[in-house]
């Protein structure tokens, strides 16, 4: 039950996170004009990954797309790439995790397969979250660098006669959305990986074959050993006896003609 809850919660948290990453990527307010001492401005500038916008005091807003690809800063291109990779990985992770959910039955899919899918989606969510966090952090670093550069030459002019106010940009809402969304996706991914450990079958029944030891009339039945998932810390071999109680999370095996001597 705890495993199902952890997996379900991981899925929901990741879903919210990826929705947030998509929202942040599409938002126009990655950087906003720094208003420092002036909270009301006649012309307010803000920029996104895909276009820059200007809002006038009348409320009129004009946005212009970055129609050039080669003319854009390499850092901006890198941020775009990171966010898109994050979205793609997250979307694939969501698709995989839907089929991995314990509450969803698809044919006769074994729990080991579900465990593997849960792990795969978990890793995808972790990488997706890291991509988003990295993308947003790179952009934030770029803003900080530019902010201090423009502060250093806040006013440039000809012989001090004419002043040109340089627009400074600070963190926009999209950065905070991106950081939170990336964090949520990361947490969701970790939860999926934790759920995977619980989903991995503790014990797997192997179909018994009767061996007749010479000089004995007793049939020997080899024990079923714990399936190796690569995540199990228990390296001891456990003997399994027929008729033992099985938990919901264990693989069900049905009697075959070799099970009984």
């Amino acid at each position: 039950m705890a495993v199902t809850a952890c997996q379900g919660l991981g899925f929901v948290v990741s879903l919210i996170g990826i929705a947030g990453i998509i929202a942040a990527t599409c938002m126009d307010q990655w950087s906003t004009q720094d208003l420092y001492n002036n909270p009301v401005t006649a012309v307010f500038n803000y920029q996104g990954l895909w276009r820059s916008c200007v809002r006038e005091s009348s409320g009129f807003t004009e946005c212009r797309g970055y129609f050039t690809l080669l003319g854009l800063p390499a850092m901006l291109q890198a941020v775009r790439a990171l966010m898109i990779v994050g979205i793609v990985l997250g979307a694939i992770g969501l698709l995989v995790s839907i089929f991995a959910l314990k509450c969803i039955r698809i044919g006769s899919m074994e729990d080991s397969a579900k465990a593997n899918m849960t792990l795969t989606s978990g890793i995808m969510f972790i990488v997706s979250g890291l991509c988003a966090i990295a993308g947003v952090s790179v952009f934030a670093n770029m803003l900080v660098t530019n902010f201090w550069m423009s502060t250093a030459n806040m006013y440039t002019g000809m012989g001090g006669m004419v002043q040109t106010v340089q627009t400074r940009y600070t963190f926009g809402a999209a950065l905070f959305v991106g950081w939170v969304a990336g964090g949520l996706t990361l947490i969701g991914g970790v939860m999926m990986c934790i759920a995977c450990r619980g989903l991995a079958p503790e014990e797997t029944n192997y179909k018994a074959v009767s061996y007749h030891a010479s000089g004995h009339s007793v049939a020997y039945k080899p024990g079923g050993f714990k399936a190796s998932t690569g995540f199990g810390s228990n390296t001891k071999n456990k003997k399994i006896y027929d008729g033992g109680a099985r938990t919901e999370d264990e693989v069900q095996s049905y009697p075959s003609k070799h099970d009984y001597v």
Partner: antibody, heavy 119, light 113 residues
Framework: QTYLQQSGAELVRSGASVKMSCKAS????????IHWVKQTPGQGLEWIGY????????HYNQKFRDKATLTADTSSSTAYMQISSLTSEDSAVYFC????????????WGQGTLVTVSA | DIVMSQSPSSLTVTTGEKVTMTCKSS????????????LAWYQQKPGQPPKLLIY???IRESGVPDRFTGSGSGTDFTLTIISVQAEDLAIYYC?????????LGGGTKLEIK
């Protein structure tokens, strides 16, 4: 047809206050800023501030922050400006103007209200 | 505050003549976000309120005759009347529409001979 009708001329005593109105018609009052501009022969045109009737937000020129108070009544599509502690320096023609949708300009103006401050 | 300086303060011309008046701002009115210059021009005829002629430094307001042309960028702007008519007798003001407080120039008085 967009039109801004301002209240009539005022003759007021020094130290008193005056409240003038600007009634808008021909457009959605709440969707546009209303700016107030002072005109004197000596100082020319000076921007006092503006009010955004839709959100009841306003912004003032620092010079007039303690002198003028801008309000608006959306139900009657009327903007008001009250000038307090009047002095001879406040004798002027006061215009209300609609903030244009583009370029932070003033696209329609009222006919003006003449305020004369007497000693 | 941005200071707007207009020149000449007055000029007298004959009808049909081309007129040019200038406006200088103490700071650039060019917005880097949309590469637009936030400057407006107004015409005030005697006994009337000002009338918007030009916004964004060069865009004519609807209904304004095409003989009025605005140009310039940054800190230097020009209003040109290609062929002056008798009804153009007025004072012309330029306005900083870029930063609060909005400021207006002292005006250029156009007189007809």
């Amino acid at each position: 047809q967009t039109y801004l009708q301002q209240s009539g001329a005022e003759l007021v005593r020094s130290g008193a206050s005056v409240k003038m109105s600007c009634k808008a018609s021909g457009y959605t009052f709440a969707s546009y800023n209303i700016h107030w501009v002072k005109q004197t022969p000596g100082q020319g045109l000076e921007w006092i501030g503006y009010i955004y009737p839709g959100k009841d937000g306003s912004h003032y020129n620092q010079k007039f922050r303690d002198k003028a108070t801008l309000t608006a009544d959306t139900s009657s599509s009327t903007a008001y400006m009250q000038i307090s502690s009047l002095t001879s320096e406040d004798s002027a023609v006061y215009f209300c103007a609609r903030g244009g949708y583009y370029g932070n300009s003033f696209d329609y103006w009222g006919q003006g209200t003449l305020v004369t401050v007497s000693a | 505050d941005i200071v707007m300086s207009q020149s000449p303060s007055s000029l007298t011309v004959t009808t049909g003549e081309k007129v040019t008046m200038t406006c200088k701002s103490s700071q650039s009115l060019l917005n880097s976000g949309n590469l637009k210059n936030y400057l407006a021009w107004y015409q005030q005829k005697p006994g009337q309120p000002p009338k918007l002629l030009i916004y964004w430094a060069s865009i004519r307001e609807s209904g304004v005759p095409d003989r009025f042309t605005g140009s310039g960028s940054g800190t230097d702007f020009t209003l040109t009347i290609i062929s002056v008519q008798a009804e153009d007798l007025a004072i012309y003001y330029c306005q900083n529409a870029y930063t609060f407080p909005f400021t207006l120039g002292g005006g250029t008085k156009l007189e007809i001979k």
